[in-house]
């Protein structure tokens, strides 16, 4: 069973001092990561017993294995059902505590009732404050039965449940009609899935005979021991004030376990700690009684004395539960109550015995759950004991269960049952997860779900290049941490697998499924610099850059140009997908904007160092385009352009700019300024004869405006080759007069 205890502090004079604590003795309890088990949960369950809403309860975690619920403000906050959930996977277990109001009309004689399948359960509600109305019994919040108030027997209302079955389990309550539900008596009925002394599917297996009030679990046959007892059969008492499956926990406070209710996994339920009894667990056991709720009687023989926590304390020369066994009878010594081995291992098990006559090797035997008897391979004889060593054949899962060491001499015999747990080494069910990658390293999460048994002691990560026949590289890591695989090859696929191990010899599990993880490209290392930039318009910018010359091929797929508009907090990114490119035209920019510009080389998804930034101010948006542009050849080297001023000007034009381009030519266009803005005509001179030209123009106020329509015109023929176009400007009217 899961080592989970829910403690309720029953000092009820002040609800603010009341607390519930859930303690787990499980390895790795409450660590909270998916692979190693969810955390402990402690909460009030309002599904059946609803109480008025109050301030939320406070949950405090103390390390990984303890959680405490506080913040109760009034007595009604305490009434109802509380549950603690712990353990991982199939071992996830819920422990339930039912709290009754000490001032209720009806009080349970006994809150927890654990019965066997087919038994008759009797719930008894004692009258604390009488009302002359019906008593309504409910099961899990639904109506179950009615009793007339005259039907009380000796001041108690009894509910008899004959032939109970597991579905009858749950929370029962007895309430006077018309009374507040908080005045009810609340009970918990636990019905074991088997008849008395049996467990397992079909209830075919025999329980180990739990001592000291331990209850046999109907699924696994283990004894759920009362608080303060330990061992496979609960045969050993803990020291006063201790509890937990291995007596590893200590009751808080100076008065030990006084005033505490202990709730354990079903089918145990709840009780006071060992040595205490009463509805608030504050009364010490009467003489001759001991154990949880003082339910056990000592009946010590041969001068033994009764200790209310542990039972009979035997004088020298005697042992046994009632000091009924003479020390002359052989006795198994210090046998562990539980042993754990991994599947397919061949462990050695030791069994020590003493007695008079002295036990010898042949008088000690080991019996497996299937009845097979093993004889010891060697024995170590010491003055006070003989230790027999047994070599166990390769373990299979069916070897899980109760083994028995038995010693027989002419003085009598003794046997000690102990539990052997055969654990299955863990095997990952999934491949590890890639978290991040670089060119020479991979960061991997090895935490995966697994089949088999925990806890996980080590995680091995095996990896090698894909399609490689070389040996696997292995790294051993802490189960809870991510792993970085270093010194890998860039742009290479690696096969990665996880291997999990649990404690003990043979605890290594099979390798999990492989997964392919690929390292990134090499990072580009070259830093470009900006050679220059040229404003081609209010929203266009031509940028050029260079790279340092280095030997070998260029590591890069292209360039990323970044323009940062600090005023608007916006970034523009332009991808240049050729690593040979050294210039780019950026369009669609915002006129009148101050940009910070840089360029980076990229390779795959990796960016190299950015160039030192440049600061570029785009001119504000200019005026509309000039209208009705017209070209007229005047000679073999001159063409006259005429136009009309743009409409709706935002201010006075400072100049016009004419663009001249040979039609079909590959060269850059030529820009010529017309510095007299009042002009509506200009002559472009120095052109080549018999050549077709394209012209367009735009005005400038604070910034350049939109381009006009493009016009075509050819110079007249047979002139000499000119040196290049120039312009002469005059008013349109004057040109026409000439």
């Amino acid at each position: 069973a899961v080592d989970l205890t829910l403690l309720a502090n029953l000092r009820l004079t002040d609800p603010q001092r009341f607390f519930l604590t859930c303690v787990s003795g499980e390895a790795g309890a409450g660590r909270g990561s998916d692979a190693w088990g969810p955390p402990l949960l402690l909460e009030k369950d309002d599904r059946i017993v609803r109480t008025p809403p109050g301030p939320p309860l406070r949950l405090a975690r103390n390390g990984s294995h303890q959680v405490t619920l506080r913040g109760f403000s009034k007595p009604s906050d305490l009434v109802g059902v509380f549950s603690c959930v712990g353990g991982a996977g199939a071992r996830r277990t819920r422990v339930i505590y039912v709290h009754n109001s000490p001032g209720a009309h009806l009080l349970p004689d006994k809150v927890t009732h654990t019965v066997n399948k087919g038994d008759t359960a009797v719930l008894s509600a004692r009258v604390h404050k009488e009302k002359q109305t019906d008593v309504i019994w409910k099961s899990n919040g639904s109506y179950f039965y009615t009793l007339d108030w005259h039907e009380a027997q000796d001041g108690r209302f009894l509910l008899q449940l004959p032939n109970v079955q597991p579905p009858s389990s749950g929370i029962y309550s007895a309430t006077y009609l018309e009374a507040s539900p908080l005045g009810s008596a609340f009970f918990r009925l636990i019905v074991r899935g088997c008849g008395a002394g049996r467990w397992g599917p079909g209830c075919t297996k025999e329980c180990p005979g739990c001592l000291h009030g331990g209850v046999c679990h109907d699924h696994d046959g283990e004894c759920v021991c009362p608080p303060g007892f330990t061992g496979t059969r609960c045969e050993q008492a803990c020291r006063e004030g201790r509890f937990g499956q291995s007596c590893q926990e200590q009751c808080p406070g100076i008065s030990g376990c006084r005033g505490l209710t202990f709730c354990l996994p079903d089918p145990y339920g709840c009780s006071c700690g060992s040595g205490w009894r009463g509805s608030q667990c504050q009364e010490a056991c009467a003489p001759g009684h001991f154990g949880a709720d003082c339910r056990l009687q000592c009946q010590c023989q041969n001068g033994g004395t009764c200790d209310r926590f542990s039972g009979c304390v035997c004088p020298s020369g005697w042992h046994g539960v009632h000091c009924e066994k003479s020390d002359r009878i052989p006795q198994i010594l210090n046998m562990a109550s539980e042993l754990e081995f991994n599947l397919e291992t061949m462990p050695r098990i030791n069994c020590a015995a003493a007695g008079n006559p002295f036990p010898v090797r042949g008088s000690i035997e080991l019996r497996k759950p299937d009845g097979t008897v093993l004889l010891s391979t060697k024995a170590i004889v010491e003055p006070e004991k003989t230790t027999a060593e047994f070599e166990v054949p390769r373990l299979v899962l069916a070897d899980s269960g109760f083994w028995e060491c038995r010693v027989s001499t002419s003085g009598g015999q003794d046997s000690r049952r102990f539990k052997v747990n055969v654990k299955v080494p863990p095997v990952p069910l999934a491949a590890p997860r890639l978290l991040t990658k670089q060119s020479r390293q991979l960061v991997v999460s090895p935490l995966v779900s697994f089949s088999g048994d925990g806890p996980i002691s080590t995680v091995r990560l095996h990896y090698r290049p894909q399609d490689s026949t070389m040996d696997w590289s292995t790294i051993v890591v802490d189960p809870s941490e991510n792993v970085t695989l270093m010194n890998l090859r860039p742009k290479t696929g690696y096969s990665v697998r996880v291997q999990l191990s649990r404690p003990g010899e043979g605890g290594e599990g099979a390798w999990g499924p492989p997964t392919l993880m690929t390292t990134d490209c090499p990072e580009p290392l070259l830093q470009p610099w900006l050679e220059g930039w040229h404003v081609e318009g209010t929203d266009r910018l031509r940028v050029s850059w260079s790279l340092p010359l280095v030997p070998g091929p260029l590591v890069g797929d292209g360039f990323l140009l970044r323009l940062w508009d600090g005023t608007r907090g916006q970034e523009r990114r332009e991808n240049v997908s050729s690593p040979q490119a050294r210039t780019a035209l950026l369009t669609g920019l915002t006129p009148g904007t101050h940009y910070q510009l840089d360029v980076q080389l990229y390779h795959c998804t990796l960016l190299g160092p950015a160039s030192p930034p440049a600061h570029v101010l785009l001119p504000p948006s200019g005026p509309p385009a000039p209208r009705h542009l017209h070209a007229q050849a005047l000679s073999d080297s001159e063409i006259q352009l005429t136009w009309k001023h743009p409409e709706a000007l935002p201010g006075p034009i400072s100049k016009y700019v004419v663009e001249v381009q040979v039609a079909g030519g590959a060269g850059d266009p030529l820009w010529i300024d017309v510095d007299r803005p009042e002009e509506t005509s200009t002559i472009i001179r120095g052109l080549n004869a018999s050549t077709r030209y394209l012209f367009r123009m735009r005005a400038s106020i604070q910034g350049l405006g939109d381009w006009s329509n493009t016009v075509e015109e050819s110079t007249l023929g047979n002139g000499l080759q000119a040196e290049g176009p120039v312009q002469e400007s005059r008013a349109a009217e004057e040109g026409l007069d000439q």
Partner: antibody, heavy 119, light 107 residues
Framework: EVQLLESGGGLVQPGGSLRLSCAAS????????MHWVRQAPGKGLEWVSV????????YYADSVKGRFTISRDNSKNTLYLQMNSLRAEDTAVYYC????????????WGQGTLVTVSS | NIQMTQSPATLSLSPGERATLSCRAS??????LAWYQQKPGQVPRLLIY???NRATGIPARFSGSGSGTDFTLTISRLEPEDFAVYYC?????????FGQGTKVEIK
Amino acid sequence: EVQLLESGGGLVQPGGSLRLSCAASGFTFSKYKMHWVRQAPGKGLEWVSVIYPSGGKTYYADSVKGRFTISRDNSKNTLYLQMNSLRAEDTAVYYCAREMGGSGWYDYWGQGTLVTVSS
Amino acid sequence: NIQMTQSPATLSLSPGERATLSCRASQSISSYLAWYQQKPGQVPRLLIYDASNRATGIPARFSGSGSGTDFTLTISRLEPEDFAVYYCQQYGSLPRTFGQGTKVEIK
């Protein structure tokens, strides 16, 4: 489906006796309080008697006390009303009714059986 | 014994109208009151319990109110199938007692 089916009504002379039965099905009969309620022709409803789930406690209206006896057989899921010393004013349709979960109101009623006391 | 008095004895209304039925207890019964509907030749049917809670399957046009000694059953818009006799019943103490009934008939 919850069903209650009364039987045993009929014509009886004053001073005579009759035993009514109510067969229950569709629910756990042994958990519920059961009642008899009657309705004289053209008149309103009148509560007659109640019996607790265990059968250990019964109550009666003053008008029938000492003459009528309510009982139940939980193994047969049947409710009974033994009526002795019948009077003309006992003429009515007799209904058995289930009390909802110890609450006091009736969530299921039988179809009724007519008892006529006349000479 | 607690006496239950219903008024009026008869209520003549048209479909679509609002019906208000009254029930008075001779002493306080808290909210321990149920209302039943009975049509000719049929068995009583539970409408309301605990003075104001609608029973399963009862339309929302039926509502109950009151506590102590005075209680009301309201049918917000009468449907043709609502014309019947209505009884109140107290279950605050034994013996259980019913009102004499209110007949809701078509005007």
